[in-house]
């Protein structure tokens, strides 16, 4: 089992749209596969798939997932909000047949506020 | 370019241990999503496929070989090797390494494939 | 295990003329969750080991030329040559990748008639 995560690095404007893709693919076929959105380490869902269909279609305030097959699994966050900047872990485990699990690497969200006096204030606020 | 290439010996006695090693150049046996099969090729051509070690060390067997088999790897070497146990003239074949990804899962790269020969 | 049986175990086709090849699962290797058949086809020729030509039941690797193709779905597949030439003289396996222990179909040999 194999996990890819992209982007690396997303900015994007507050009230706008945030796509975060997970690719993953097994070389063999799978019954269940559970799935799991981290966000700064904390579970925003825990999903699984089967018959082709996610067992949840929200994850995390403002979240959205989908499966696209054969590999794809989006979470899309529409609004997004200040509160969503943090980083973004997409893990994979087959359940059925056997346990296998993998993990992508971090993807890191960046949230502009859509008033450019507080990304002042913000920028302003950076140690250094 | 991966590379996959068999070395051990050509003639084993019955019931003792077959050992072979595959060495790959071009590509690190570590890399995620990467699995390193042996495969066998008996005289009249049947193909069966013994087992992999993956990428991060675990281990598949076919059952047809009732734990006579045994895949381990030397990851500073970057190769990985097979054990066939109790050997009899019916493992007499051809035994190829080749990888596969879980991305794109078929053999894509194969060794040359060395002959064994189980006789006393 | 899934059996994986060919037909037929050889054939002979004049130059130029089609070959069809014909593999049968003894389960179905279409999964709903991928949308995938995990099912793919080998050419070897004689002293070479085997070489990848159509993976997924029916994508044909780069650099594999577009006279061969493969379909089917489920339990019943098919490798077809549209024209025959002289190189494409070989053993044909079928090989699926649904569940472990992977296993290959006994093969076809293609001769020119």
């Known amino acids: 089992l194999s996990v890819q995560q992209g982007p690396n690095l997303l900015q994007v404007r507050q009230g706008s749209q945030a796509t975060l893709v997970c690719q993953v693919d097994q070389a063999t076929a799978w019954e269940r596969l559970r799935v799991k959105w981290t966000k700064d380490g904390a579970i925003l869902c825990q999903p699984y798939i089967t018959n082709g269909s996610l067992s949840l279609g929200v994850c995390g305030p403002q979240g959205r997932l989908s499966w696209q097959a054969p590999s794809h699994l989006t979470l899309q966050l529409d609004p997004v909000s200040l509160n969503h900047s943090g980083a973004y872990v997409c893990w994979a485990a087959v359940e059925i047949p056997e346990l296998e699990e993998a993990e992508g690497n971090i993807t890191r969200l960046f949230v502009d506020p859509d008033d450019p006096t507080q990304n002042r204030n913000r920028i302003a606020s950076f140690p250094g | 370019q991966v590379q996959l290439q068999e070395s051990g010996p050509g003639l084993v006695k019955p019931a003792q241990t077959l050992s072979l090693t595959c060495t790959v150049s071009g590509f690190s046996i570590s890399t995620s999503g990467y699995y390193w099969s042996w495969i066998r090729q008996f005289p009249g051509k049947r193909l069966e496929w013994m087992g992999y070690?993956?990428?991060?060390?675990?281990?598949s067997y076919n059952p047809s070989l009732k734990s006579r088999v045994t895949i381990s790897r030397d990851t500073s070497k970057n190769q990985f090797s097979l054990k066939l146990t109790s050997v009899t003239a019916a493992d007499t074949a051809t035994y190829c390494c080749?990888?596969?990804?879980?991305?794109?899962?078929?053999?894509?790269?194969w060794g040359q494939g060395t002959m064994v020969t189980v006789s006393s | 295990d899934i059996v994986m049986t060919q037909s037929p175990d050889s054939l002979a086709v004049s130059l130029g003329e089609r070959a069809t090849i014909n593999c049968k699962s003894s389960?179905?290797?279409?999964?709903?969750?991928?949308?995938?058949?995990?099912l793919n086809w080998y050419q070897q020729k004689p002293g070479q080991s085997p070489k990848l030509l159509i993976y997924h039941a029916s994508t044909r690797l780069s650099g594999v030329p577009d006279r061969f193709s493969g379909s089917g779905s489920g339990t019943d597949f098919t490798l077809t040559i549209s024209s025959l030439q002289a190189e494409d003289v070989a053993d044909y396996y079928c090989?699926?990748?649904?569940?472990?222990?992977?296993?290959f179909g006994d093969g076809t040999k293609l001769e020119i008639k």
């Open positions: 080749a990888t596969m990804a879980d991305r794109f899962a078929f053999f894509d790269v």
């Open positions: 389960q179905s290797l279409f999964s709903s969750n991928t949308n995938r058949n995990y």
């Open positions: 070690i993956n990428y991060g060390g675990g281990t």
């Open positions: 090989q699926h990748h649904y569940e472990t222990p992977l296993t």
